[in-house]
């Protein structure tokens, strides 16, 4: 049985092999139970967490993780050296920077040590699983009487990231958003001097160095303009 799993992380080619033992048709052995799916995310290309839902096991099981890189110099099978735990049961593995090869096919294998034939293998494209740190050091400057420019920094190579800027005033119910490319600069051409604006930014590893779907966390917000909270009932909700 070879099952293709459409994962929510852009790795449509991830395949999982479930190894079955021979058995009577009226009973299922433990080795037929599917293993949980492994989800990996690479945080700012500094470390990677590969995690699974340990509570999906019928009984508490310390599943083990092995990994290697397909068709590369790094194709030797490696054991996880830093397990993550949930209620004293293995629920993930953390890999350090030197173990991460973004542009080679990463193969991860989960196994039940009590039932070695019960194992599942997935292939992942790590360049599609990078989540950058949130943008930092947001600054606003006035370009003209009515125009504002928002700048920010990222702790990664600028051209590898795209960004989403959101802004709203005290009086807005919802955010207005604007996509921004690797130049990490945003201009708001028409600013109302009577309103207070809030801006925030998030970033994504896409499209020049990878094709990640997941955004970073939002930056800390930055504000501009007069504080009109006395007149405006929406401001408290905005700050909450």
């Amino acid at each position: 049985l070879n099952t293709t799993i459409l994962t929510p992380n852009g790795n449509e080619d991830a395949t999982t092999d479930f190894f079955l033992t021979s058995m009577p048709t009226d009973s299922l052995s433990v080795s037929t139970l599917p293993l949980p799916e492994v989800q990996c995310f690479v945080f700012n290309v500094e470390y990677m967490n590969c995690t699974w839902n340990s509570s999906s096991e019928p009984q508490p099981t310390n599943l083990t993780l092995h990994y290697w890189y397909k068709n590369s110099d790094n194709d030797k099978v490696q054991k996880c050296s830093h397990y993550l735990f949930s209620e004293e049961i293995t629920s993930g593995c953390q890999l350090q920077k030197k173990e991460i090869h973004l542009y080679q096919t990463f193969v991860v294998q989960l196994q039940d040590p009590r039932e070695p034939r019960r194992q599942a293998t997935q292939m992942l494209k790590l360049q599609n699983l990078v989540i950058p740190w949130a943008p930092e050091n947001l600054t606003l400057r006035k370009l003209s009487e009515s125009q504002l420019e928002l700048n920010w920094n990222n702790r990664f190579l600028n051209h590898c990231l795209e960004h989403l800027v959101q802004y709203r005033t005290d009086w807005d119910h919802s955010w207005t958003e604007q996509s921004v490319d690797y130049r990490h600069k945003f201009s708001l051409p028409s600013v109302d001097g009577q309103k207070r604006y809030t801006f925030r930014v998030r970033s994504r590893f896409n499209p020049l160095c990878g094709s990640a779907q997941h955004w970073s966390e939002w930056s800390h917000p930055i504000h501009w303009g007069s504080n009109s909270s006395k007149e405006n009932p929406f401001l408290f909700a905005l700050e909450a």
């Epitope: 290309v45 590369s72 920077k97 090869h101 973004l102 542009y103 080679q104 360049q127 920094n153 702790r155 990664f156 190579l157 600028n158 051209h159 590898c160 690797y182 020049l208 160095c209």
Partner: nanobody
Amino acid sequence: QVQLQESGGGSVQAGGSLRLSCTASGFTFDDSDMGWYRQAPGNECELVSTISSDGSTYYADSVKGRFTISQDNAKNTVYLQMNSLKPEDTAVYYCAAEPRGYYSNYGGRRECNYWGQGTQVTVSS
């Protein structure tokens, strides 16, 4: 803030030499692949040479045997030694930084304006 600052360009006679330098800041230099691109007026951005974090190098056919790329991790600097320069080497040269493994396993077209301002190299005959 990620920054790449090129220097060392200038005007030189054909057959002469120049050494370009690129100082990097704001990212982990020794964990990145570095490269040099160039763009002549009216031409596309062209990859000239790369050096990977493991020290492996690449050269475009047009510069093989004449250009040498190197890096100094302690100084966060990558160099391009250009010898036997030809008029067709005239261009703005840009320093580039990529995630580790990009050049050897991924690749893809780049625009020269992704990085710094570049440094002008002019070779006259």
